[in-house]
């Protein structure tokens, strides 16, 4: 037994403990986040292939038939048996591919029938021998260590025909003879040997499901007999090598064992955990327990499969136990498909490589592990742009790194699978697993590096993951007039103040006649007190929450439909206006200044008064005039107290609603822009001189990054996303008075090619003058960064006009609604705004994340800390005039994603204290930080407000 870093003994057989470890770890716990670190020095980086998958030349130069050659001919509908990457012919091209990657080893398998056509060791096939000698010598010349697999499923057909294949014990000796020859012939150049690749699949699919060669099925006893013979064959070869070759060749030998991974339905259920353990031992344990464990099959199997599972004698147990110099492990798609043949035990299949490595550590006493196969697959139509493969690899590799660095698992090497596209067993040529793309129909079978090859090369070059995404955190503060805000969506006004107390001038006597009623006392009139803002229950609640938040600003939206139910000034809801005035005045008493949004579209009815909605909403240009009238009313009623106005929240997201055709989307956007501009000019001319406020609109502004940094079309798509999503509104307002040239040209080009019939509206000269410059600051709502790829789409929809597709980076910390936490995205966005629209004041008017926690919302705290830190870098390093940060949002809504600092029933979460601290510190001051801002200075608008009160 080995000791781990904590000096605790790991006793074999304790794999089930994996599912009980830290079930309630926070998602932001360092052990759960992507790990930026390096692999151990001299980590063994490799790549692998299987002979049958890549060699081709199936009957060339005297090669014998294999079970897979026969299986293809009889069971699989494959057009050409030689459609592989033809490595037998194009060895030099394989070597160049290996050079490109910079690997330390190449794992390949020897084709038994290429060396010995009928399977028996007589005279080796000279041409086959020459090929493997050339391969080995060429590798050593390049300082690439060969890792050689003796058997990767291509059994000589002669042995299948004559003996029934691995069902027959005769194969044990025949395999040993073949191995002996290989040790004698190649052993001087090979330090790592693998006897058999994934015996589980040979037995299970070869003799159980019939999905693999030789394609036998239905005989359960045969499956376990085959497994038994494979174990004995391996064991015999190990002892042979150990006795006769290791002393002078000084190599290591193992067997590659493959497995899936499984998670319990309920983490706390002992029954489910036992089922998971059973699932693992019946696949991986079937072969690992005899070799790496106690020499026998797992107890679960011996009990359950009594009649079909062969028994080991005590001598055989001793013989098989310990016959591996390291644990060679395969984790890839072949152990996961087809799903219906898996031992799932009703639990959940998972791709968590870190967990399965921990299971091996606990179950088998922390052996040294070589990951002998790892990777995923792409569809056959994918050529060099295998973006999802990058993310699968990134995820797997980081899980390995976490297992090594955080869990003390002794992984010493990693084999990316596969070097080349080739024959993928029961999938034939319908999937690809190569790091290099091969066109099987081309004469020369060129090996073209895929994005995943570039990525793997980079990881090898850096021996891991170096933090390439951040400037070190700063200590520093925001300016003293910085707005620390919280955002709320639409505040629905209370129709009646909740307290009628003192509004009735009469005096009453209760129960004077015993009838338990009130009797008015005639002739007496009392002084009433006027209605007070605190009569509104919701305002009281609001104020309590805001006071706890310690914010300097509160951003909320008015409900247009409540203020003007008819959509015009013929019917003004004075009570609603009074309610909103109360929200503002009461806030100001607490030194909390308002930022008021006039129009906050909601999906249900777009937040429009019903008559406007029915007359076409934003597709009707007259809605802009109605909006002007409504805005004017609000400026008159509230403008003396409100210094920051937002006309429309996220007009660039209305496409979600006006999505019948792209032309609806673009027309609605056009009318919204004009409506905003009309209101800005109205404020500028009539209200600014006396009210001295500022006005803008808030744009949804998520950042975009190319999903695949190695492909130009991806960063072009990311650029296009920014143009279609943000510049669409920002360009007319903050720069040219027209839509972005790039957007206009892209849509026109698609329309010319018949891929769309979209038309971006034109601004008249008057409209251009109206729109250009119609904003006093840049307001943006930023939540996340999207990973973007190019995908050509047809049809006249705004979403398809962009030719953009999104990819979820599985390695990123994400929220329940899959919002990725990528703090540096906000800094890049702010820099983009400055570059494109100049040195103007910028407010982040909403920024936040959904977090499942009802109380201890650690994800939200992490998000706030990291995003505000990036905003500080933008201010201090990039000289961006950031004026405020408004966290989203005050309260969450029932059955909606949990974005709130308070629950829907007003319970406070712990992120409030964290945000308090940020506000009080005005950022991240150093211990002996510079001068703190005094409170009044931090709230310049409020001095005026207090005078007004």
């Amino acid at each position: 037994d080995y000791k781990d870093d904590d000096d605790k003994l790991d006793f074999p057989g304790d794999g089930r403990a994996v599912w009980s470890q830290n079930p309630n770890l926070s998602p932001v716990n360092e052990s759960q986040l992507f790990l930026y670190d390096t692999f151990p020095k001299n980590f063994f980086w490799g790549v692998g292939t299987g002979a049958f998958q890549v060699e081709g030349s199936w009957k060339k130069d005297g090669k014998g038939l294999s079970v897979w050659d026969h299986f293809i001919a009889t069971h699989l509908n494959v057009s050409s048996r030689d459609g592989s990457s033809d490595s037998y012919i194009f060895l030099e091209k394989d070597l160049s591919a290996l050079d490109f990657l910079g690997v330390s080893f190449y794992q390949f398998s020897i084709s038994w029938p290429r060396l010995f056509p009928d399977g028996t060791v007589a005279v080796a096939n000279a041409k086959g021998l020459q090929y493997y000698n050339r391969l080995l010598d060429s590798l050593l010349l390049r300082n690439i260590e060969p890792v050689v697999t003796l058997y990767h499923w291509d059994l000589p057909w002669a042995l299948q025909e004559k003996y029934g294949g691995w069902k027959n014990e005769t194969l044990i000796d025949l395999f040993n003879d073949y191995a002996t020859y290989c040790f004698q012939t190649f052993g001087d150049r090979v330090k790592y040997w693998i006897t058999i690749h994934n015996p589980y699949l040979v037995a299970w699919h070869g003799y159980g499901t019939g999905l693999h060669a030789p394609g036998e099925k239905g005989n359960v006893a045969a499956v376990y007999t085959v497994g038994h013979n494979l174990l004995k064959a391996h064991s015999k070869v190990w002892h042979n090598y150990n006795r006769n070759f290791r002393p002078h060749q000084k190599g290591w030998l193992s067997i590659t064992l493959g497995s899936h991974w499984i998670e319990p339905n309920r983490a706390e259920s002992i029954v489910d955990i036992l089922k998971c353990q059973q699932s693992m031992v019946s696949v991986l344990g079937w072969f690992a327990n005899p070799i790496h464990g106690d020499g026998d099959y797992p107890e679960v199997m011996t009990k359950k499969l009594l009649s079909v599972l062969p028994a080991f004698s005590e001598a055989e147990k001793n013989e098989v136990r310990g016959t591996a110099d390291f644990f060679a492990f395969s984790f890839g798609p072949n152990n996961f498909k087809p799903l219906n043949t898996m031992a799932k035990m009703g639990q959940n299949v998972s791709l968590n490589l870190r967990q399965v490595l921990n299971w091996i550590k606990l179950e088998y006493g922390n052996p040294r592990i070589l990951i002998a196969e790892n990777g995923w697959f792409t569809d056959s139509y994918v050529q060099t742009e295998d973006t999802t493969a990058i993310y699968m690899m990134k995820n797997f590799l980081n899980q390995v790194l976490q297992a090594i660095r955080l869990d003390g698992v002794r992984v010493f090497g990693y084999t990316a699978w596969s070097l080349l596209d080739g024959f993928e067993w029961q999938d034939a040529y319908n999937t690809r697993r190569g790091l290099f793309y091969v066109d099987f129909n081309s004469e020369q079978r060129e090996r073209r590096p895929k994005s995943s090859a570039h990525y793997y090369k980079q990881v090898i070059g850096e021996n891991g993951f170096t933090l390439r995404e951040a400037t070190p955190d700063l200590q520093g503060q925001f300016p003293c007039d910085f707005s620390w805000g919280v955002t709320e969506s639409v505040l629905k006004p209370e129709s009646v103040a909740s307290s009628p107390q003192f509004s009735d001038p009469h005096l009453y006597v209760w129960n004077a006649t015993g009838n338990r009623m009130l009797h008015r006392v005639e002739g007496v009139r009392l002084k009433t007190r006027p209605a007070q803002c605190t009569d509104f229950i919701t305002i009281k609640k609001q104020l309590e929450m805001l006071a706890r938040m310690k914010v300097t600003h509160f951003r909320f939206a008015l409900d247009w439909a409540s203020v003007l139910p008819t959509g015009n000034l013929s019917e003004v809801n004075r009570q609603a206006l009074r309610y909103y005035r109360c929200v503002v005045t009461e806030g100001l008493k607490l030194n909390i200044s308002p930022m008021v949004t006039l129009y906050y579209p909601t999906h249900a009815h777009l937040g429009l008064p019903a008559p406007l909605l029915h007359s076409g909403g934003w597709l009707d240009p007259s809605t802009a005039k109605a909006f002007r009238d409504y805005a004017g009313l609000c400026f008159r009623e509230l403008g003396d107290l409100v210094k920051l106005w937002i006309t429309i929240n996220e007009p660039n997201r209305l496409s979600d609603v006006y999505n019948r055709t792209s032309n609806d989307t673009y027309q609605a956007a056009h009318n919204l822009l004009i409506a905003h501009a009309i209101v800005w000019h109205l404020y500028d001319r009539q209200y600014r001189p006396s009210q001295r406020g500022a006005l803008s609109l808030s744009l949804h502004s998520d950042w975009a990054e190319p999903a695949n940094p190695y492909v130009a079309s991806h960063w072009q798509a990311a650029e296009r996303f920014l143009q279609f999503e943000i510049a669409w509104f920002a360009e007319p307002l903050f720069k040219t008075g027209d839509y972005p040239v790039a957007m206009r040209e892209y849509i026109a080009s698609k329309t010319r090619r018949g891929l769309s019939s979209s038309v971006l509206p034109r601004f008249s000269d008057a409209e251009r003058r109206l729109v250009k410059g119609a904003a006093d600051f840049y307001a943006l709502n930023h939540f996340t960064t999207r990973f973007v790829m190019h995908e050509q789409q047809n049809g006249s929809r705004y979403d398809s006009d962009r030719d953009v597709q999104f990819l979820q980076d599985i390695t990123r910390l994400s929220s329940p609604t899959r919002l990725a936490v990528i703090p540096w995205g906000v800094r890049k966005l702010l820099r983009w705004v400055r570059r494109n629209y100049g040195d103007m004041d910028i407010y982040i008017t909403a920024s936040g994340i959904d977090d499942q926690a009802l109380q201890n919302d650690q994800l939200r705290q992490y998000y706030l800390e990291k995003y505000v830190q990036e905003a500080l870098k933008a201010y201090l390093i990039d000289k961006i005039k950031i004026k405020g940060y408004y966290a989203f949002k005050l309260t969450e809504e029932k059955s909606k994603p949990r974005f709130g600092f308070f629950t829907s029933d007003f319970k406070a979460k712990s992120s409030i204290q964290f945000y308090n601290k940020l506000i009080t510190s005005n950022g991240f001051p150093s211990e002996n930080g510079g001068p703190r801002c005094n409170q009044t200075q931090g709230n310049p608008e409020c001095t005026v407000c207090l005078l007004l009160l």
Partner: antibody
Framework: QVQLKQSGPGLVQPSQSLSVACTVS????????VHWVRQSPGKGLEWLGV???????DYNAAFISRLTISKDNSKSQVFFKMNSLQTTDTAIYYC??????????????WGQGTSVTVSS | DIVLTQSPTSLAVSLGQRATISCRAS??????????MTWYQQKPGQPPKLLIY???NLQSGIPARFSGSGSRTDFTLTIDPVEADDVATYYC?????????FGGGTKVEIK
Amino acid sequence: QVQLKQSGPGLVQPSQSLSVACTVSDFSLTTYGVHWVRQSPGKGLEWLGVIWSGGSTDYNAAFISRLTISKDNSKSQVFFKMNSLQTTDTAIYYCARDYGSTYVDAIDYWGQGTSVTVSS
Amino acid sequence: DIVLTQSPTSLAVSLGQRATISCRASESVESYGNRYMTWYQQKPGQPPKLLIYRAANLQSGIPARFSGSGSRTDFTLTIDPVEADDVATYYCQQSNEDPWTFGGGTKVEIK
């Protein structure tokens, strides 16, 4: 095709200022930024500063106190002004177009250069 | 400021052979997954010409015999095969951090 044409004096007295205009054609200054780079035998290529499409500027800290870059979008002109020149400022001064993509920070087209000698 | 050191300072190559120019940065010029390294070619009496951006992307109109590679602090420009028209000085430039800086140049001649 994309062009950047520079005009400016060849000779400047020490302690005087240098003004160079760069007139661009076939692209808009509201879409592309314009950089200024100089090249001298002693110091090789030196990046001086940039004016971005939105009008904001970034300067090399070594020149920030004596450099101003401005532009007139409607006239497709960018203006470069450097004060207090010394003999060490003798160089070829280039205006050059930014690649124009958020994800590529590079210069893709250069003016022909203005050869400036600082001498009394 | 980030210092870029090019090597060799001059290079004589036979026609049809490969030329490799190295550029080493005093600190990483990679951030946010982008490699902010650019290569230019300058012929006598002419302004520089863009060859490669983002370390490995070929500018349109530039022949495929030019290629770029590298990450973090070590970058390489390769010309393979070298042609007579490639006689020039080659500069690397980083834009990861202000001020943008250039390497000292590598002069390529034909043997």
